[in-house]
């Protein structure tokens, strides 16, 4: 599997999409996991609804949400209020039995918020009647990892 890089801005939301063959993975729940080390296990962060037919319902674990368009074949993960510690290698997975097939390997990169260096007077805050989420720009830049690039620093 090639690794796809998704870049997001600290403090904003990042949306990660994982396309898949909707017939090949029909009936299978999906999951988003974080790779622990280059050869380590992938630790489950969040999975879709226990009932596959309800996979379109967004499920949250902390600041991470998952939803699955099972007809179109797109799994979408939202990382809300992106933080530097969210950077790292992840996987979109298709579950069958106790096993998981990798749909996509994802490297999340967190960019510094360019507004951080401005005066507070220049910042815009949502009014009381406006939801905080509405004020967030869904920010997602993706690219494939170039040959030779490694998602983890080499270990000595």
């Amino acid at each position: 599997h090639n690794t796809t890089v998704f870049q997001g801005v600290a403090g904003q939301s990042l949306q990660v999409s994982c396309p898949y063959d909707s017939m090949k993975h029909w009936g299978r729940r999906k999951a988003w996991c974080r790779q622990l080390g280059e050869k380590g296990p992938c630790q489950r962060v969040v999975s879709t609804h226990n009932l596959w037919l309800l996979s379109f319902l967004r499920r949250w674990n902390g600041s991470t949400a998952i939803t699955d368009d099972t007809l179109g074949g797109t799994l979408t993960i939202t990382l809300r209020n992106l933080q530097p510690h969210d950077a790292g290698l992840y996987q979109c997975q298709s579950l069958h039995g106790s096993e998981a097939d990798t749909l996509r390997k994802v490297l999340v990169e967190v960019l510094a918020d360019p507004l951080d260096h401005r005066d507070a007077g220049d910042l815009w805050f949502p009014g009381e009647s406006e939801s905080f989420e509405d004020a967030h720009v869904e920010h997602s830049i993706s690219r494939s990892l170039l040959e030779g690039e490694i998602p983890f620093p080499p270990t000595s």
């Epitope: 017939m23 009936g27 729940r29 039995g97 106790s98």
Partner: antibody, heavy 123, light 107 residues
Framework: EVQLVQSGAEVKKPGESLKISCKGS????????IAWVRQMPGKGLEWMGT????????RYSPSFQGQVTISADKSISTAYLQWSSLKASDTAMYFC????????????????WGQGTLVTVSS | DIQMTQSPSSVSASVGDRVTITCRAS??????LAWYQQKPGKAPKLLIY???SLQNGVPSRFSGSGSGTDFTLTISSLQPEDFATYFC?????????FGQGTKLEIK
Amino acid sequence: EVQLVQSGAEVKKPGESLKISCKGSGYSFTSYWIAWVRQMPGKGLEWMGTIYPGDSDTRYSPSFQGQVTISADKSISTAYLQWSSLKASDTAMYFCARQRTFYYDSSDYFDYWGQGTLVTVSS
Amino acid sequence: DIQMTQSPSSVSASVGDRVTITCRASQGISSWLAWYQQKPGKAPKLLIYAASSLQNGVPSRFSGSGSGTDFTLTISSLQPEDFATYFCQQADSHPRTFGQGTKLEIK
């Protein structure tokens, strides 16, 4: 009506090659995994491997990896099981079976089976 | 690999009897288990999937139960056509593995 029709019985000598087939009809052949299962004379069932004809993604049981090759031709809705060099111990009935995922539990089971192909390897 | 062990290996019963076959997995497999019936010279037939769900067209006298490591297949009232060999199979992980079979014979 969903059907899996397998090729006829084969009698071969050790060292010969062989390719048996399993033709699917009555459903979208490219949308379901097809597995191969071995049953040696008077014995139980052994899962050999499986293929998704839509993109030819293939999984093998470690016991059969390198011993057989599973392939498919989606244009004619047919899956294949082949040997490059048969042994007497390959004598068995071979079944193909459709794997259906049941959305209640996100796992798959063999819901339709071919009639079986008897392979006899003897010098 | 997950080992599946069936008991008994064979059982003799009469038409109308209630029969129970058990299957034990070497490790927990949740409810990812199927039961198949096979008659001599024929292909196996799916009876039960997900441990307790009855496959379409299978008579209601067949039922399955269990989760984790211990499972049972019950035939509530044996009919002449039920004399066959029964296999359990785990769908938890690869490689898929089957029990060795239980032969149900006429007493």
